[in-house]
């Protein structure tokens, strides 16, 4: 015999679900135990069966899930999955916030990514902070040169996609450049998109040659010579 335990706790890491009104929300608490446990749901500490909810709810016990379609502000609250068997019980809380704000294009924090100067061989981090009502996706782009030109015949720049990521709202997205070389110098763009549209901001990376230790040591004296 075994008390209930979470089988996929990594799928339960997102505790706060902030979703726009009208969206579908799914909470999962995949569990196991011996005997096979049962699952029930509470809303704000009270047994929750969705009778008073327009559209009701879908309970899929074999998937350990609760699904609510077309959420409205009155669905806000703390949802608790309670998993029990004869040996013991476990519970987990999810917080649901229903957003009524007008969803907008992603907003990128001014000044990020920032123009950066680095020395050959060093590591560089470019930051991009995104504010978005809808879950944003991010791309990091590097502007490149093809056949000596930065732009195609259509007038649009040539770019290379370095990284693509889905992030949570208001998270900082980082592009790591390790052991930079002169070829890494150039323009980098953080692109953030959501269901409304895309937003871009760019920065320049300047890469300096490796410092000569002899030259560096002599440099202060040179300033004072006649």
């Amino acid at each position: 015999q075994q008390a209930p335990y979470w089988t996929h706790p990594q799928r339960m890491e997102k505790k706060l679900h902030a979703v726009p009104a009208g969206n579908t929300v799914k909470f999962r608490c995949p569990a196991a135990g011996n005997p096979t446990p049962t699952i029930r749901w509470l809303k704000d500490g009270q047994a929750f069966h969705g009778e008073n909810r327009i559209g009701g709810i879908r309970l899929r016990h074999q998937h350990w899930s609760l699904v609510m379609e077309s959420v409205v502000p009155s669905d806000r609250g703390t949802y608790t999955c309670l998993v029990e068997n004869a040996v013991g019980s476990i519970r987990y809380n999810y917080l649901l916030d229903v957003l009524e704000r007008s969803p907008h294009r992603p907003i990128l924090q001014a000044g990020l990514p920032a123009n950066t100067t680095a020395v050959v061989g060093s590591d560089v981090e470019l930051l991009c902070k995104v504010y978005s009502d809808a879950q944003p996706h991010i791309q990091w782009l590097k502007h490149i040169v093809i056949n000596g030109s930065s732009f195609g015949a259509d007038g649009f720049p040539y770019v290379q996609v370095l990284k693509t990521a889905d992030i949570n709202s208001s998270e900082v997205e980082v592009l790591y450049l390790r052991n930079v070389s002169a070829e890494d110098a150039g323009e980098y763009t953080c692109l953030a998109g959501n269901s409304i549209g895309l937003s871009y901001q760019s920065a320049w990376l300047t890469v300096l040659p490796e410092e000569d230790p002899t030259w560096t040591a002599a440099a202060p004296e040179a300033r004072y010579t006649d």
């Epitope: 726009p20 907008h104 990128l108 001014a110 879950q135 269901s195 409304i196 901001q201």
Partner: antibody
């Protein structure tokens, strides 16, 4: 050729339901948000709803919230609009419109490709 | 919601002459990325709208250079430098910065 083709329109009584479809071709449908826009006879354009590329985010105009549901099947390259509790004021041509892509775009980030539209008439 | 107000309601233009349509938004359409998200469309009889101008002043591919967009923040203008017979239709401005996306009421352009 990039194309959007709407279907499913027709004449329906008030209070009844209808489901519109929009078949996409010529581009990677699963990488784009998609919108519905409508136009009442002799009137201007009204945005109805949007769905994100993966279906995880949906937004609606207040005039249809709670009655209409936007959805998509990326395996079939098809966008849907389920319209319930239809009213006379829902009478319009319904256009399917391509929205923003998932990544870098040359040119506008959406609202560049429109279907020909499908007519919905709500009348008793 | 952002309200888009278009003027005039209709316009009758002699071929070869210029035409100008104005659009005002109730809020700034200048975004944090420096772009202004106003789009212009023309809708010809029995057809869906066709994109002319995006992000304030960029001509969409295939659009003749007699069409131009300008303005800033809340006041926008679509200009046709020399109107041609094929330019007949209803012109709409649209804000593409937040949902609900909203359109101007339309300006009907006719040929004298």
């Amino acid at each position: 050729e990039v194309q959007l083709v709407e279907s499913g329109g027709g004449v329906v009584q008030p209070g009844r339901s209808l489901r519109l479809s929009c078949a996409a071709s010529g581009f990677t449908f699963s990488s784009y948000a998609m919108h519905w826009v409508r136009q009442a006879p002799g009137k201007g354009l009204e945005w109805v709803a949007v769905i994100s590329y993966d279906g995880s985010n949906k937004y609606y105009a207040d005039s249809v919230k709670g009655r209409f549901t936007i959805s998509r099947d990326n395996s079939k390259n098809t966008l849907y609009l389920q319209m319930n509790s239809l009213r006379a004021e829902d009478t319009a041509i319904y256009y399917c419109v391509r929205g923003a892509g998932r990544g870098y775009t040359y040119g506008p980030d959406g609202f560049d490709i429109w279907g020909q539209g499908t007519m919905v008439t709500v009348s008793s | 919601d952002i309200v888009m107000t278009q003027t005039p309601l209709s316009l009758s233009v002699t071929p070869g002459q210029p035409a100008s349509i104005s659009c005002t938004s109730s809020r700034s359409l200048l975004h944090s990325d420096g772009k202004t998200y106003v789009y212009w469309y023309v809708q010809k009889s029995g057809q869906p709208p066709q994109l002319l101008i995006y992000e304030l002043s960029n001509r969409f591919s295939g659009v003749p250079d007699r069409f131009s967009g300008s303005g800033s923040r809340t006041d926008f203008t679509l200009k046709i430098s020399r109107v041609e017979a094929e330019d007949v239709g209803v012109y709409y401005c649209m804000q593409y910065i937040e949902a609900p996306l909203t359109f101007g009421g339309g300006t009907k352009v006719e040929i004298k």
